[in-house]
Structure formats: C-alpha cells, structure tokens
C-alpha cells in the first residue's frame, strides 16, 4: 500500500505581508496527479476556497483582488488525487498592514549613537495597543515583538539596544497591533535611520551585499540585551 500523498507547498505573491486594498495571490503546488486544490483558513468554516488545477495540474491559484481583514490569517492547502486527499501544507500566515493608524518611531537619546553606548528605540501609538513590532530592513528575521502581559493596553514600547555595535545601524520601522488578531497590523511608522559612529574594529557590512536567508549578524540588532522595560510588555523574538 502506498504511503500518504506528499504535502503541497503553499506561498503568497508578492509576499505574505500585504497592505490593505492591495492584491495578493496564494499559490498551492502539489503533484501532476492533482484533480482539485483546497485552501482552508484557520478558525473559519471550511473549505475556505477550492480551485481546479492550472495546467500541467501541479498547482492552483487563489486570488485576493483586494486585501481586507477577512483574508488575514493562517492558511493551509490540500490537493485531491485519484487516491484521496494529500497531507496539509505547512501553514502560510497572511498579514495585513494598514488596519490601524501608524505609530511614531524615535531613538533615545538620539539616532546618532557611538559604538559601545546604549540607545533605545521607542515606538508610540496614538491609541492604546498591546503588541508592538520592530522591523529592520534587510534583516533575515526582521520581527521583534513586545507584547503586553494579560492584554494590558500600552501607548508605547521600548526596544533597548546595548551595547550598540555597527550592525545595529540601519533603517527601522515599527508597527502596532491588537492581540485579538496577530495578523492585523497598523500602517508602518515612518522610517528611522540609526547611525552608529566611532567603530573601527567592527566595520559596517557593505550595504550592497546580498541578504542571507539564514540567521547571521544582521539578526543581532533585533536581540537587544537588558531587562524587559517596566511598561508591562513581554519580549518575544521570532
């Protein structure tokens, strides 16, 4: 007896973080024997969507012409072959930005910092939120969460970095969110350029170098040391 059908591959184009109102296409790739593809969304009635395969039958396209809150969430896909349904794909998390007004990102005491010193990035929202995310451009794993304990609402989150080295330099943005949906984020803050000076022994990497998809030095800025701030927020690294 044959084993279970191999699980399909699920991905989104142009990516899995989509601004409100923009289009996104979800692709599910199975095998040439696929007769039908099914997409399920976590915590929603199933099936979320069904599509016939595109020739040569090894994948299907699920189109979202205009991103809204309804489409944000965690998806899996399956395909049906003559011998039955496949295993589910690995999950795809589709995140929508633009659900809330943009926060403000600032650096204390200054965005110009000397190597070896300390700096704190401060993300502030106009309305109270319970999750804040810091994004560093071109980082392999760019998300750092600060989530409040017990659902307490905060107007700001602090991201301390100490001691600062040259790899902390770069462009940052932050987002805010409510805990009831981790898939709905605010508009991004305006970018903040953190400039690290006075480091000869630790030169900054060339800005034109290719981005690695594996963990590496570019991840280090998002792992600040020090205790969790007194704001009641708990730190999560992803």
């Amino acid at each position: 007896q044959a084993g279970p059908l191999p699980k399909p591959t699920l991905w989104a184009e142009p990516g899995s973080v989509i601004s409100w109102g923009n289009s996104v296409t979800i692709w599910c790739q199975g095998t040439l024997e696929a007769r039908e593809y099914r997409l399920d969304k976590e915590e929603s009635p199933a099936p979320w969507d069904r599509q016939n395969p595109l020739e040569p039958k090894n994948k299907a396209r699920f189109s979202i012409p205009s991103m809204t809150e309804d489409y944000a969430g965690r998806y899996r896909c399956y395909y049906r072959s003559p011998v039955g349904w496949s295993q589910p794909s690995d999950p795809l998390e589709l995140v929508m930005t633009g659900a809330y007004s943009k926060p403000t990102l600032s650096a204390l005491p200054s965005p110009l910092v000397t190597s070896g010193k300390s700096v704190t990035l401060l993300c502030q929202s106009r309305s109270p939120m319970d999750t804040f995310l810091l994004i560093k451009e071109r980082a392999a794993h760019p998300l750092l969460h600060l989530r409040s304990e017990h659902g307490a609402q905060q107007h700001q989150a602090e991201f301390p970095m100490s001691p600062v080295t040259s790899v902390h330099g770069g462009t940052y943005r932050c987002f805010s969110s409510h805990g009831f949906s981790h898939y709905l984020l605010s508009h991004p803050s305006d970018p903040l350029e953190l400039i690290v000076s006075g480091s000869l022994e630790d030169p900054r990497p060339s800005p034109t170098r290719s981005v690695s998809t594996a963990a590496g030095p570019e991840d280090q800025p998002l792992m600040p040391t020090g205790s969790v701030p007194h704001s009641g927020l708990r730190r999560h690294w992803e």
């Epitope: 399920d40 969304k41 915590e43 929603s44 009635p45 199933a46 099936p47 979320w48 969507d49 069904r50 309804d70």
Partner: nanobody, 121 residues
Framework: EVQLVESGGGLVQAGGSLRLSCAAS????????MGWYRQSPGHQRELVAA???????KIGDSVKGRFTISRDNAKNTVYLQMNSLKVEDTAVYYC???????????????WGQGTQVTVSS
C-alpha cells in the same frame, strides 16, 4: 435538478421560534460550506449564518445570540434554528452552498429557491 431544497418557513409571532431546513445533494453537502442568506423588500441580501465541513460557524451580527446553524452529515441537511424572532427578521430565507470565500463575496456557487419567514407583531 434541484440541488438545495428549503422548508420550514411560515408565519410566527414576535418572540417565537422557527427551524428552517435545507436538504442538499450529497456531492454538494459533503464538500461545501452550507449557509443561509435572507432578503427583505428594499434591502440587500444578507448573510445570516454559515457552517463549514469542519463544524466551524459564522453567525451574522444582527442575529447573534438568537439564531444557530447546524449540519447533519447523515441527512445531508443544514438547519437554521431561529429563536426570539423580531418583526425585522421578516424576509425570504435562501439556503446556499459554496466555498466560504464566496460567502464573503455574497456569491455562493449554489442557491435554493427560498422560503418565506414572516414575523408578526
């Protein structure tokens, strides 16, 4: 061939209850979200409730706490239990089937003929 057949509509007093049924062909019932829409004169068609093959449900805001939806897999039938009915619940109720994303777009793949529910004061 009629693939969705509704029953159970009628006239009821405000505060009363009704249970609508929708029988579907096995091929449709086993692979689709089943749900109910309603439409009253001068109003757009509104999603009342839906239930997936995974048992998860979506209930419209205007009927939350009063209406429940369930599906009987052995009978290929979906039920809408309507309690504490109000005059404003008066409408033609349509059974529908399709992928859930089609319900969000108000365009399920299959529709019944509709059954009239009238709530009097």
């Amino acid at each position: 061939e009629v693939q969705l057949v509704e029953s159970g509509g009628g006239l009821v007093q405000a505060g009363g209850s009704l249970r609508l049924s929708c029988a579907a062909s096995e091929s449709i019932f086993s692979s689709n979200v089943m749900g109910w829409y309603r439409q009253s004169p001068g109003h757009q068609r509104e999603l009342v409730a839906a239930v997936g093959i995974n048992g998860l449900t979506k209930i419209g805001d205007s009927v939350k706490g009063r209406f429940t939806i369930s599906r009987d897999n052995a009978k290929n039938t979906v039920y809408l239990q309507m309690n504490s009915l109000k005059v404003e619940d008066t409408a033609v109720y349509y059974c529908a089937a399709g992928a859930y994303v089609r319900f969000l777009q108000n365009s399920p793949d299959y529709w019944g003929q509709g059954t009239q529910v009238t709530v009097s004061s």
